[in-house]
Interface confidence: low
């Protein structure tokens, strides 16, 4: 059994934990319908640009179909996943499966997300995961709003090979990409991590029913959620331990792809979809 929540971040460096201002943080407010309409052409282009992405998507698509076929028997199980929320489409499920699969995709994707916000031009011309970014963002929004009442979660995240340094006590920070965490303390500690996070998240959504590894009780946190550093300690031999509490959200970008496509010639009106 693989433990992807830690394995998805296999780096070996020290990194500043701050507002991650170079990360691409679009929330697609007012342009979800337009983005959805743009997906077929956009995804087709991105498949051509990245074989890892294309392969992961096809594998995830097969897995999604298999899970859909098994849905009737799951509905009888005591540990059955909740039905998808209103508005949740096949491609949301496929995107979550593709992201959580034990393949190089999540690593490539998050590395790209962390850099894609350097400039609008960088996102538009050099970020080849626009489809995946949108689908994951929308999936988390749908899964989050599908919780009744909306819920915050205490989660745990172990990162192997990467030590985070908080900007300072009580600093406001973001995680910089999509961050996988677990409702189970033990799952996050599985690898003898270099950084251990305890996180109170309100925008992260449980994705157990949509993960390749449902046993992990995974929660996925979007890149635009902001946190306050509550406590940070770093022992000489042990892991860095960082405790974060949800503050809210912050995005530098909104609807950049649609603005570029639709708003070059004249005024642009984004809907509230």
């Amino acid at each position: 059994q693989s433990h992807p929540i830690t394995r998805r971040d296999l780096f070996s460096q020290e990194i500043q934990l701050d507002m991650a201002l170079a990360s691409f943080d679009d929330q697609y407010a007012g342009c979800a319908a337009a983005m959805t309409a743009a997906l077929p052409d956009l995804n087709h282009t991105e498949f051509q640009a990245n074989q890892v992405y294309a392969d992961s998507w096809t594998l995830a698509s097969s897995q999604w179909q298999e899970r859909q076929a098994r849905w009737p028997e799951w509905s009888l199980s005591p540990t059955r996943p909740s039905p998808p929320p209103l508005g949740f489409r096949d491609e949301h499920g496929v995107a979550l499966l593709a992201y959580t699969a034990n393949s190089p995709l999540h690593k490539e994707f998050n590395a790209a997300v962390r850099e894609a916000g350097r400039s609008r031009a960088h996102y538009l011309h050099h970020f080849s995961f626009k489809t995946l970014h949108f689908l994951l963002t929308e999936a988390l929004q749908l899964l989050g709003s599908g919780q009744r009442p909306p819920r915050c979660h205490q989660v745990f995240r172990g990162v192997h090979g990467l030590r985070f340094r908080p900007a300072g006590p009580r600093a406001t920070v973001r995680l910089g990409g999509f961050a996988s965490a677990s409702l189970k303390h033990v799952a996050a500690q599985q690898f003898g991590e270099d950084t251990f996070f305890g996180i109170w998240t309100c925008l992260g959504a449980p994705i157990k029913g949509y993960s390749f590894f449902p046993g992990e009780e995974e929660v996925l946190i979007p890149p635009f959620e902001t946190f306050q550093v509550i406590n940070a300690s770093r022992l000489a031999q042990g892991p860095a331990r960082i405790y974060l509490r949800a503050l809210g959200k912050h995005s530098t970008y909104n609807c950049e792809y649609i603005k570029d496509k639709k708003c070059k010639s004249g005024p642009c009106h984004l809907d509230n979809s």
């Epitope: 077929p40 074989q51 392969d55 489409r89």
Partner: antibody, heavy 117, light 106 residues
Framework: QVQLQESGPGLVKPSETLSLTCTVS????????WSWIRQPAGKGLEWIGR???????NYNPSLKSRVTMSVDSSKNQFSLKLSSLTAADTAVYYC???????????WGLGTMVTVSS | EIVLTQSPGTLSLSPGERATLSCRAS???????LAWYQQKPGQAPRLLIY???SRATGIPDRFSGSGSGTDFTLTISRLEPEDFAVYYC???????FGPGTKVDIK
Amino acid sequence: QVQLQESGPGLVKPSETLSLTCTVSGGSISSYYWSWIRQPAGKGLEWIGRISTSGFTNYNPSLKSRVTMSVDSSKNQFSLKLSSLTAADTAVYYCARDGWGRVFDIWGLGTMVTVSS
Amino acid sequence: EIVLTQSPGTLSLSPGERATLSCRASQSVSSSYLAWYQQKPGQAPRLLIYGASSRATGIPDRFSGSGSGTDFTLTISRLEPEDFAVYYCQQYGSSTFGPGTKVDIK
């Protein structure tokens, strides 16, 4: 523009293995998925399987035990092997390019395969 | 496994008339995963519509697709002589095809 051409034997004996090749011209085979689809005379279309240029395969569950696909990027070709043939495998076999998701945007002309002793 | 049913099996119309073809899925299908193809005798199928309503490159605007959930429709606003053919819908999450609707000349 991209064109696809199927090649292989028109007649195969029952219990033998069918081998077909699809040659892609007018463009690179790289960065796409490539599928095989068949159509018995007067009937509908049945997807057989797909392969990526990195060798990732995905087969129709009903045919999975008999299907093997491979790709040779240097020759811009991909191939299908279908084993343990019966008369029910008699059909026109098409190769096609997989576009976004799994939509087939470019097709070969098709090749007729008859399984008979 | 999702099963697609097409109706009618055969549609007999005259050139200039409007054709409405139906495709029904046994369970809900994302509209992003439904396509339509046209096949003429002795030829390979040709992609017409993907994502339920987006026309493929080079397809005339008399062809349009609509629908969501389990019910999808292909409409040919004014039949041209070259439009008489068999039309297949496809759920391309699992690469399943419908049995086809034949549009022939009345």
